[in-house]
């Protein structure tokens, strides 16, 4: 058992029919040592008197908030939570496996820029009684200080005949090097509560690894006379890292018909133009990527050809 | 070339063979993004790697002021890979593809240290961590993560070359 | 005490389509994962599926994804095993058993038998 | 998927012996690994998880130890009740994947 925070406990239980469970002593917070009772959430039903109470905890119905009482009046509270260990593995109810880019992705993360600043997000299918708490910071063994806010409900979507809820949060390293090469991977911890059961979950990366730029900014086709070419022109993304000079990108140009099926012409630059032949009816779209690091490409900028 | 004595690099030339790093030091690994390296315990193994740490100089601000501290930073770090890259690691069991760009990416990492170390001038370099896996499937986990670890150090470098180049140079 | 108890099992002709079942009783089973093995006669084991508590979470082996389908009704201690398209070497004896992982209360099993 | 290989295929002992009966994965299960015994015409039935905890009911003279890809399941002393199949089984990566099963009979 241990103190999740002030007055919750968390009662790590291998879980399986006919478990043990754990014996779990409660200790009421206050001086008094005489004519003390204990009752389990709403129930008048009294489990014991005396400072301390002892409980075997094994399943869910032993679970929830304790309290001591003297004489009609409240003492002191106990919240216990459960976290289920099957067959030596944590439990991962409260959260939707991602599996991208692999299996128990339960967080994904992105960066728009080398500033520090990133974006976590989780989904599940539990609409109430839910709560997130969200930890980070830069190494595990000598942690360096990474500030995370609240997470808050970002999206809802249908997903066949489920609900799914998508959560994120925000987080800024407090002493960020933006132009440093990481050694040591970005740590985020997730405790999340569903009623009385708790989980945690876990992320480790390097910024460089989830680095996904804004898409290219004001994107402008510049028809070229006597010709069906066009010279596109495009900006870096506020968002992005500056000096640009130094935090460079490596851009993708991409025309691509009505049909789905129709070939794509796609050519690579540097550079914030190019010239490409625009189709009747296609459109050209242009994204972006760190130069000398190979993570995301950010999502597509598009005009249409006419 | 960088001379002795604090004058600039030959940062086009710099710039151009750091890029050219950056794109053989993926395709010598591109998958590796998709492998989590340090669920496999590599604390051992690539942390004595040296790595560009932010008191190195290698900022924008920090190029401006004096770039020969990054300078030394990335020579003695391309020196470094580019014993790793020649040692049993890479030349042992299991063998390379003939076409492997690891080939390449040795010569390149030398070709970027010679121009910025010329003949006769010798900063310090660091020691070589004596690793010699046993098992041919080690050895193969230890490459991808010196190919990881070789991506992001060359990545800084190329920054620093491209900023060099359209800022610092002559 | 734990017990589970399968039952649905049968002859039953290629391609075609079975329901088994698998009552449990001696503890909460809306608490527990929940997971099929089945046996071949004569020959080893080999897991089926699983489904965590809430059904929210569901595993196949490759064998069976696309044609089984594995449920549960928690307000019945019922977990179900819905097996479409049949095969010759889906013949076996079908055990549901409780956890995700390590098997560790069993039932006595059901003979599914797939022959023309 | 991790392939699991057990041996030997057979195992001919007397009551009062001990049998080490040894399991192979094809590649690392960490601690990941149980064992099952299954007597004729039954279900099998839980020895060990966790490659070394004894389940509950079952006796002290059923261990099992090792880690990585090399386990065994020792057995100090044979009963009558030991002779049966005995199947190890990993559960550190999807599909959860059995051995073929030692068998061991009484000489």
């Known amino acids: 058992i241990w103190e999740l925070k002030k007055d919750v406990y968390v009662v790590e239980l291998d879980w399986y029919p006919d478990a043990p469970g754990e014996m779990v002593v409660l200790t009421c917070d206050t001086p008094e040592e005489d004519g003390i009772t204990w009752t389990l959430d709403q129930s008048s039903e009294v489990l014991g008197s005396g400072k301390t109470l002892t409980i075997q905890v094994k399943e869910f119905g032993d679970a929830g908030q304790y309290t001591c009482h003297k004489g009609g009046e409240v003492l002191s509270h106990s919240l216990l939570l459960l976290h289920k260990k099957e067959d030596g593995i944590w439990s991962t109810d409260i959260l939707k496996d991602q599996k991208e880019p692999k299996n128990k992705t339960f967080l994904r993360c992105e960066a728009k820029n080398y500033s520090g600043r990133f974006t976590c997000w989780w989904l599940t299918t539990i609409s109430t009684d839910l709560t997130f708490s969200v930890k980070s910071s830069r190494g595990s063994s000598d942690p360096q200080g990474v500030t995370c806010g609240a997470a808050t409900l970002s999206a809802e979507r249908v997903r066949g005949d489920n609900k799914e809820y998508e959560y994120s949060v925000e987080c800024q390293e407090d002493s960020a090097c933006p132009a440093a090469e990481e050694s040591l991977p970005i740590e985020v911890m997730v405790d999340a509560v569903h009623k009385l059961k708790y989980e945690n979950y876990t992320s480790s990366f390097f910024i460089r690894d989830i680095i996904k730029p804004d898409p290219p900014k004001n994107l402008q086709l510049k028809p070229l006379k006597n010709s069906r070419q066009v010279e596109v022109s495009w900006e870096y993304p506020d968002t992005w890292s500056t000096p640009h000079s130094y935090f460079s990108l490596t851009f993708c140009v991409q025309v691509q018909g009505k049909s789905k099926r129709e070939k794509k012409d796609r050519v690579f630059t540097d550079k914030t133009s190019a010239t490409v032949i625009c189709r009747k009816n296609a459109s050209i779209s242009v994204r972006a990527q760190d130069r000398y690091y190979s993570s995301s490409w950010s999502e597509w900028a598009s005009v249409p050809c006419s | 070339r960088a001379v002795p004595g604090g004058s600039s690099p030959a940062w086009t030339q710099c710039q151009q063979l750091s890029q050219k790093l950056c794109t053989l030091a993926w395709s010598a690994h591109p998958l590796v993004g998709h492998m989590d390296l340090r669920e496999e315990g590599d604390e051992e193994t690539t942390n004595d790697v040296p790595h560009i740490q932010c008191g190195d100089g290698c900022d924008p601000q920090g190029l401006r002021d004096n770039s020969q501290f990054c300078l030394q930073r990335i020579h003695q770090g391309l020196i470094f890979y580019e014993k790793l890259l020649g040692s049993d690691i890479f030349t042992g069991e299991p063998s390379l593809l003939p076409d492997s760009p690891v080939g390449q990416l040795h010569a390149s990492l030398l070709g970027l240290s010679q121009l910025l170390q010329p003949e006769g001038h010798h900063w310090e370099t660091q020691q070589i961590p004596s690793l010699s896996p046993s098992q041919p499937w080690q050895r193969l986990l230890l490459r991808f993560k010196i190919l990881r670890s070789l991506q992001a150090f060359v990545a800084v470098a190329a920054r620093v070359f491209a900023h060099g180049a359209a800022t610092l140079s002559p | 005490e734990v017990q589970l108890l399968e039952s649905g099992g049968g002859l039953v002709q290629p391609g075609g389509s079975l329901r088994l079942s698998c009552a449990a009783s001696g503890f909460t089973f809306s608490n527990y994962s929940m997971s099929w093995v089945r046996q071949a006669p004569g020959k080893g084991l080999e897991w089926v599926s699983s489904?965590?508590?809430?059904?929210?979470?569901?595993d196949y082996a490759d064998s069976v994804k696309g044609r089984f389908t594995i449920s549960r009704d928690n307000s019945k201690n019922t977990l179900y095993l819905q097996m479409n398209s049949l095969r010759a070497e889906d013949t076996a004896v079908y055990y549901c058993a409780t956890g995700i992982a390590v098997a560790r209360y069993w039932g006595q099993g059901t003979l599914v038998t797939v022959s023309s | 998927d991790i392939q699991m290989t057990q041996s030997p295929g057979t195992l001919s002992l007397s009551p009062g012996e001990r049998a080490t009966l040894s399991c192979r994965a094809s590649q690392s299960v960490s601690s990941y690994l149980a064992w099952y015994q299954q007597k004729p015409g039954q279900a099998p039935r839980l020895l060990i998880y966790?490659?070394?905890n004894r389940a509950t009911g079952i006796p002290a003279r059923f261990s099992g130890s090792g880690s990585g890809t090399d386990f065994t399941l020792t057995i100090s002393s044979l009963e009558p009740e030991d002779f049966a199949v005995y199947f190890c089984q990993q559960y550190a990566s999807p599909p959860r994947t059995f051995g073929q099963g030692t068998k061991l009979e009484m000489k």
């Open positions: 966790g490659a070394s």
């Open positions: 489904i965590r508590s809430s059904g929210g979470r569901t």
